[in-house]
């Protein structure tokens, strides 16, 4: 039975040209995290594998940095980066947990962080 929950940074906004950290946290389970995939609308951004380390997809190699932790840092943001991002936790023995973050990249300098929320 899957007892864990994914806590994410929720709905967030950031300024065009700036950076943002995408963070997810798995709690309420003793399952072992074997791999975390970061995806943007079915497109793979990065992989963090517990045994093998990080892989950044080539299309994002100049704008994505691994970390902090299992999170992901997006740099040089453009308005095209607006959209849904998913952290997909592969765990043993529980299986897969998915968290969702919505990022809005704003032209103005009034970018405020949204509230944190949980996805069971």
């Amino acid at each position: 039975m899957m007892t864990g929950t994914i806590e994410t940074t929720g709905n967030i906004s950031a300024e065009k040209g700036g950076s943002i950290i995408l963070q997810c946290h798995l709690s309420s389970t003793t399952a072992q995290v074997t791999q975390v995939n970061w995806e943007q609308q079915d497109q793979l951004l990065a992989i963090c594998n517990a045994d093998l380390g990080w892989h950044i997809s080539p299309s994002f190699k100049d704008r994505v940095a691994p970390g902090p932790g299992l999170g992901l840092t997006l740099q040089s943001l453009t308005v095209n980066d607006t959209g849904e991002y998913f952290c997909i936790y592969h765990t043993y023995p529980d299986g897969t947990y998915t968290g969702r973050i919505f990022l809005e990249v704003l032209e103005s300098s009034v970018a405020e962080h949204g509230a944190r929320f949980q996805i069971p």
């Epitope: 074997t34 793979l44 992989i47 594998n49 093998l52 380390g53 990080w54 080539p58 299309s59 190699k61």
Partner: antibody, heavy 121, light 106 residues
Framework: EVQLVESGGGLVKPGGSLRLSCAAS????????MSWVRQAPGKGLEWVGR??????????DYAAPVKGRFTISRDDSKNTLYLQMNSLKTEDTAVYYC????????????WGQGTLVTVSS | SYELTQPPSMSVSPGQTASITCSGD??????ACWYQQKPGQSPVLVIY???KRPSGIPERFSGSNSGNTATLTISGTQAMDESDYYC?????????FGGGTKLTVL
């Protein structure tokens, strides 16, 4: 020891089938993205196709010349990669290598010794 | 279909620098890898993810990739570097090899 060992090559008639195997050892095979690459006699390297890890969907991609005829699969419990080749043509004659995709720093650039497939009547 | 273009052959004197180019549309948006292959042997990865060198590969091998061109540079070329070199474009949907460059060390 970290290694890949291919087997299953041989002589087959045009239109025939063959299944190649690649036994992996010394590394976490289940997380590796694996490719098959071939090299016709005296020619360059040609990518055949690849299979992603199950944790990345386990999906497959193929080069145009083999799409619909070749199928790549994996058995992570046996640390083995497979290449099922159907409707073989004379131009499929080549040495077939299995290799890890250059995904992770500590698991990249592994190649087997190759196995020769000859398609001839 | 995606194509990579390499010079079929080139020569270099021992101790000199050899630069092998590989061109393809928006190659800089993919990862470029380079393989060395000697007759009768399996290929050996010398550069991956544009500029990373696997352990055991000498420092004289370096790589770069931007725009439409990836370059493998061999500084202080040695006789043992005489080989065929293949570039590879890699991304999460496809893989393509260049036609190969035969490097002769004169």
């Amino acid at each position: 020891e970290v290694q890949l060992v291919e087997s299953g090559g041989g002589l087959v008639k045009p239109g025939g089938s063959l299944r190649l195997s690649c036994a992996a050892s010394g590394f976490t095979f289940s997380y590796a993205w694996m490719s098959w690459v071939r090299q016709a006699p005296g020619k360059g390297l040609e990518w055949v196709g690849r299979i992603k890890s199950k944790t990345n969907g386990g999906t497959t991609d193929y080069a145009a010349p083999v799409k619909g005829r070749f199928t790549i699969s994996r058995d992570d419990s046996k640390n083995t990669l497979y290449l099922q080749m159907n409707s073989l043509k004379t131009e499929d004659t080549a040495v077939y290598y299995c290799t890890t995709d250059p995904l992770y720093d500590i698991l990249t650039g592994l190649w087997g010794q190759g196995t020769l497939v000859t398609v001839s009547s | 279909s995606y194509e990579l273009t390499q010079p079929p052959s080139m020569s270099v004197s021992p101790g000199q620098t050899a630069s092998i180019t590989c061109s393809g549309d928006k190659l800089g948006d993919k990862y470029a890898c380079w393989y060395q292959q000697k007759p009768g042997q399996s290929p050996v990865l010398v550069i991956y993810q544009d500029s990373k060198r696997p352990s055991g590969i000498p420092e004289r091998f370096s790589g770069s990739n931007s725009g439409n061109t990836a370059t493998l540079t061999i500084s202080g070329t040695q006789a043992m570097d005489e080989s065929d070199y293949y570039c590879q474009a890699w991304d999460s949907s496809t893989v393509v090899f260049g036609g190969g460059t035969k490097l002769t060390v004169l």
